[in-house]
Amino acid sequence: HPIPDSSPLLQFGGQVRQRYLYTDDAQQTEAHLEIREDGTVGGAADQSPESLLQLKALKPGVIQILGVKTSRFLCQRPDGALYGSLHFDPEACSFRELLLEDGYNVYQSEAHGLPLHLPGNKSPHRDPAPRGPARFLPLPGLPPALPEPPGILAPQPPDVGSSDPLSMVGPSQGRSPSYAS
């Protein structure tokens, strides 16, 4: 099972983190990244089964993102369009994870260097006016078998963990205080 955030094992890339990727960039409405059954990728205002993701380090600082419900990997075309694929293509579906000082993360295609951001509202497939990288807040996700506890209205605390926080973070990125030794 995915391990708790407090575990020192998260200092290594071997573990799967179950997360919702939440973005609240000013240019678009607040949303959780969703990988849908038909392979489209979009944003949902609320957490949903389609937005529960598994983040796993492939290499130091590089991750793959799997939709738990759909068993589809998050992938990106050379033009920046996002899609969900049952087949993992390392060229299209690997993302460099960069930690920001405020607890948010930025994801870039390892192959193309293109930033990951949700499609704009006009088109479900691609954003015709690419912007800078979107910032995502990884929110903890419960294991699939466990329902969300009822009656909790407060937002979940931010998870500032990285799949590999002790390895490849360059001098320009922040380091999460939760991993300070």
Epitope: H1, P2, G14, Q15, K56, P60, L66, S71, F73, L86
Partner: antibody
């Protein structure tokens, strides 16, 4: 071409230690995790542990706690595994591997360790 | 730890036949399953990972499928160089564990 070069066979006495090197070439050493796998004669494979070459952080199979210590030397692109307090059940072939999301995409040729008095 | 159970333990097949090897995980491992081939006296080689992604240089006659806890490796039109042992391995969460292996022999 990616290559993981291991040292030759080792014959060691019970209670002794052995340190097996694995020299990586053909790729950037710090870009991938390095791992180790045990294969006893005629048996399946057992994952021992992985190490992040950037910082030496390791994650180990608890079955090998106190038995195997993983280290790296970035300057020579070499990973090491030290096995201590060797006993007959440690007789096996030990492989170094390159890790990619937990899959092991390249393997060394293996180092045979025989524990015998 | 997650247990991986492979079947059959061994099989005999002729060149040109189709072979299917199965692997069962003791719990859900999602899409994190790999397959390896090992020839006598040699190191294992990665064939497939993430259930169905072929490793570099692996012929397209190999294919992986499955989900959750049940997986299979299919070899279409078995070639002489395909004989050897095959192992499944989960790469969901450490410790990674392997199946007991399937020995594919010439009939």
């Amino acid at each position: 071409e990616v290559q993981l070069q291991q040292s030759g066979p080792e014959l060691v006495k019970p209670g002794a230690s052995v340190k097996i090197p694995c020299k990586a070439s053909g790729y950037t050493f710090t870009d991938y995790y390095m791992g180790w796998v045990k294969q006893s004669h005629g048996k399946s494979l057992e994952w021992i542990g992985d190490i992040n070459p950037n910082n030496g952080v390791t994650i180990n199979n608890q079955n090998f706690k106190g038995k195997a210590t993983l280290t790296v030397d970035k300057s020579s692109s070499t990973a090491y595994m030290e096995l201590r307090s060797l006993a007959s059940e440690d007789t096996a072939v030990y492989y170094c591997t390159r890790g990619y999301g937990g899959a092991l995409d390249y393997w060394g040729q293996g180092t045979s360790v025989t524990v015998s008095s | 730890d997650i247990q991986m159970t492979q079947s059959p333990a061994s099989l005999s097949a002729s060149v040109g036949e189709t072979v299917i090897i199965t692997c069962r995980a003791s719990e859900n491992i999602y899409s994190y399953l790999a397959w390896y081939q090992q020839k006598q006296g040699k190191s294992p080689q990665l064939l497939v990972y993430n259930i169905r992604t072929l490793a570099e240089g692996v012929p397209s006659r190999f294919s992986g499928s499955g989900s959750g806890t049940q997986f299979s490796l299919k070899i279409n039109s078995l070639q002489p160089e395909d004989f050897g042992s095959y192992y499944c391995q989960h790469h969901y969460d450490s410790p990674w564990t392997f199946g007991g292996g399937t020995k594919v022999e010439i009939k």
